[in-house]
């Protein structure tokens, strides 16, 4: 799940079995000119960045779990 | 590589109490969860609870509530569990077990220690 | 508090047989449950988790399946040193419950 920082696609790959508990935020990248696929990247409660499937029903499910509550906050 | 390492057997008067610890080795110790669990002589597993040491955050169940008490020293990367009020229901086998950050799985675990309340 | 049920209790089998343990949980927990595998005298083992993703060093020989309620866990061509306790673990919704626990034998 590590995750690069230049100007291409940031995923070289994901993390399976993600749990929302220790997620803290999450950065949903949509495709650009530097990264053809959407890109979801995760900071967990220690800091650490996490790729996550963006194909994933879970990932799905905290992706929308996350924008409820900012919207709610 | 990541080791827990449970401090040894206590044998304890019913009405007193004790503190156990766990030192942890081979990681960011702050960054993880910890977790306790209690297995009673022939019985199954029991989650007690948890703390985020970089924090101190404590998540507990509420079975367990009043009864343990979970507290972390980064300084010396060691997680402890006083147990208070001991009866003989508290004589068990306790382990700590570290919680992985990103899938929350309990991938390491101690040896244990047996602690007995007997008069 | 999510309950767990697991079954058999115990169960003997031979080795290079198969055996399968089932845990119904007592609501959707999301395929996050793990298997841990119990020996005397030593800390649990995690095999599996999040329903079916093998714990490194773990081998191919188990295997788990499920999703919403039920789920089961599998190893197959038994050998000697599988004869262990195993639990279940629900960990979708805080306290994180366990099964009973299988406790496992050899014919």
């Known amino acids: 799940a590590s995750v690069a920082t230049e100007l291409r696609c940031q995923c070289l790959q994901t993390l399976q079995g993600i749990h929302p508990k220790n997620i803290q935020s999450v950065n949903v990248k949509s495709p650009g000119p530097h990264c053809a696929q959407t890109e979801v990247i995760a900071t967990l409660k220690n800091g650490r960045k996490a790729c996550l499937n963006p194909a994933s029903p879970i990932v799905k499910k905290i992706i929308e779990k996350m924008l409820n509550s900012d919207k709610s906050n | 590589q990541v080791q827990l390492q449970q401090s040894g057997a206590e044998l304890v008067r019913p009405g007193s109490s004790v503190k156990i610890s766990c030192k942890a080795s081979?990681?960011?110790?702050?960054?993880?969860?910890m977790n306790w669990v209690k297995q009673r002589p022939g019985q199954g597993l029991e989650w007690i609870g948890q703390?985020?040491?970089?924090?101190?955050?404590?998540n507990y169940n509420g079975k367990f509530k009043g009864k343990g008490t979970l507290t972390a020293d980064k300084s010396s990367s060691t997680a402890y569990m006083q147990l208070n009020s001991l009866t003989s229901e508290d004589s068990a086998v306790y382990f700590c077990a570290r919680e992985r950050d990103y899938d929350v799985a309990m991938d390491y675990w101690g040896q244990g220690t047996s602690v007995t309340v007997s008069s | 508090d999510i309950q767990m049920t697991q079954s058999p209790s115990s169960l003997s089998a031979s080795l290079g047989g198969k055996v399968t343990i089932t845990c119904k949980a007592s609501q959707d927990i999301n395929k996050y449950i793990a298997w841990f595998q119990h020996k005397p005298g030593k800390g649990p083992r995690l095999v599996i988790h999040y329903t079916s993703i093998l714990q490194p060093g773990i081998p191919s020989r188990f295997s788990g399946v499920g999703s919403g309620r039920d789920y089961s866990f599998s190893i197959r061509n038994l050998e000697p040193e599988d004869i262990a306790t195993y639990y279940c673990l629900q960990y979708d919704n805080l306290p994180w419950t366990f099964g009973g626990g299988t406790k496992l034998e050899i014919k």
């Open positions: 081979g990681y960011a110790f702050s960054d993880y969860w």
């Open positions: 703390i985020y040491p970089g924090d101190g955050d404590t």
